[in-house]
């Protein structure tokens, strides 16, 4: 299962950590995809490492752990964020976070 804070808030110009937690007795995480609505933010592969989408490379920092640190937030960053955990064996698990960026 995926456990996450469903709603988080942060100040404009500040930063926020996007974090999902996956727990399973049998499946191992092999990849985690992070998306802002339908737009790819970053991917973490246990074997291949991190890929951060070029459009976000100046504002998205991998970590901590399998999460992301989203920096220099703007009001336009308000919205839904999704983590997708790919596991082996087991399948796909999704989590949702709503980020509200507030005026500073």
């Amino acid at each position: 299962t995926i456990d996450t804070k469903r709603n988080i808030s942060a100040e404009e110009g500040g930063s926020v950590i996007l974090q999902c937690h996956f727990s399973s007795d049998t499946a191992e995480v092999t990849q985690v995809d992070w998306k802002q609505q339908d737009q790819l933010l970053a991917i973490y592969s246990v074997d291949l490492g991190w890929h951060v989408a070029s459009v976000f490379s100046d504002r998205v920092v991998p970590g901590p752990s399998l999460g992301l640190t989203f920096q220099s937030l703007t009001m336009n960053d308000t919205g839904e964020y999704f983590c997708t955990y790919h596991t082996y064996p087991g399948g796909i698990y999704k989590g949702r976070i709503f980020l509200k960026v507030q005026e500073s």
């Epitope: 990849q31 074997d47 291949l48 997708t84 790919h86």
Partner: antibody, heavy 125, light 107 residues
Framework: QVQLQESGPGLVKPSETLSLTCTVS??????????LAWIRQPPGKGLEWIGS???????YYNPSLESRVTISVDTSKNQFSLKLSSVTAADTAVYYC?????????????????WGQGTMVTVSS | EIVMTQSPATLSVSPGERATLSCRAS??????LAWYQQKPGQAPRLLIY???TRATGIPARFSGSGSGTEFTLTISSLQSEDFAVYYC?????????FGGGTKVEIK
């Protein structure tokens, strides 16, 4: 540019073990950030993924073949290999080695970017 | 595992015409889909990754679209060298799975 070449016997007897090797040239497995994969194609049929291995030794297998498959890597020889035990006529196929995820860091996708030419293996007594 | 289904099995098209190939996943794969072209006696070649991005050296007449469970490969104007078998494939998750293929033949 990385290139792949499969090698091994073209004929294997039923119940024996099929053994194939893929030699990687133009790049070092030990420093490469990609998966090394085996895929097969029975005559006149489609593609079937057999399994993949990362340089660290992490392996992932097709569940339908898992009990019979072993994939290993020899970084010193820049090779990886496939062993498929207890073969039957249904294992007759062209066997391809491939590299998967070579462009992950740059482009964020995992696909079979580079393929060997393939080697035909017939299972028959 | 995710089952990939391609249709049609065979597509008869005249040179210069448009070809539209379909691929359906049994569950959502987001945009984690690749297309390959295979000619007789040759290894497959990567055409499209990420559902819509052309691989290096692939002509602009090849385009991919779709996300989730429904995907399409379009060849805008078929050339003689395009008559081949086309496969879709999802990745990730494990296990990697291919569709059964669509053969594009000369009408």
């Amino acid at each position: 540019q990385v290139q792949l070449q499969e090698s091994g016997p073209g004929l294997v007897k039923p119940s024996e073990t099929l053994s194939l090797t893929c030699t990687v040239s133009g790049g070092s497995i030990s420093s490469g950030s990609y998966y090394l994969a085996w895929i097969r194609q029975p005559p006149g049929k489609g593609l079937e993924w057999i399994g993949s291995i990362f340089r660290s030794g992490s392996t992932y297998y097709n569940p339908s073949l898992e009990s019979r498959v072993t994939i290993s890597v020899d970084t010193s020889k820049n090779q990886f290999s496939l062993k498929l035990s207890s073969v039957t006529a249904a294992d007759t196929a062209v066997y391809y080695c491939a590299i998967e995820g070579a462009n992950f860091k740059d482009f964020g996708y995992v696909a079979f970017d580079i393929w060997g030419q393939g080697t035909m293996v017939t299972v028959s007594s | 595992e995710i089952v990939m289904t391609q249709s049609p099995a065979t597509l008869s098209v005249s040179p210069g015409e448009r070809a539209t190939l379909s691929c359906r996943a049994s569950q959502s794969v987001s945009s984690n889909l690749a297309w390959y072209q295979q000619k007789p006696g040759q290894a497959p070649r990567l055409l499209i990754y990420g559902a819509s991005t052309r691989a290096t050296g692939i002509p602009a007449r090849f385009s991919g679209s779709g996300s989730g469970t429904e995907f399409t490969l379009t060849i805008s104007s078929l050339q003689s060298e395009d008559f081949a078998v086309y496969y879709c494939q999802q990745s990730p998750p494990w296990p990697r799975t291919f569709g059964g293929g669509t053969k594009v033949e000369i009408k």
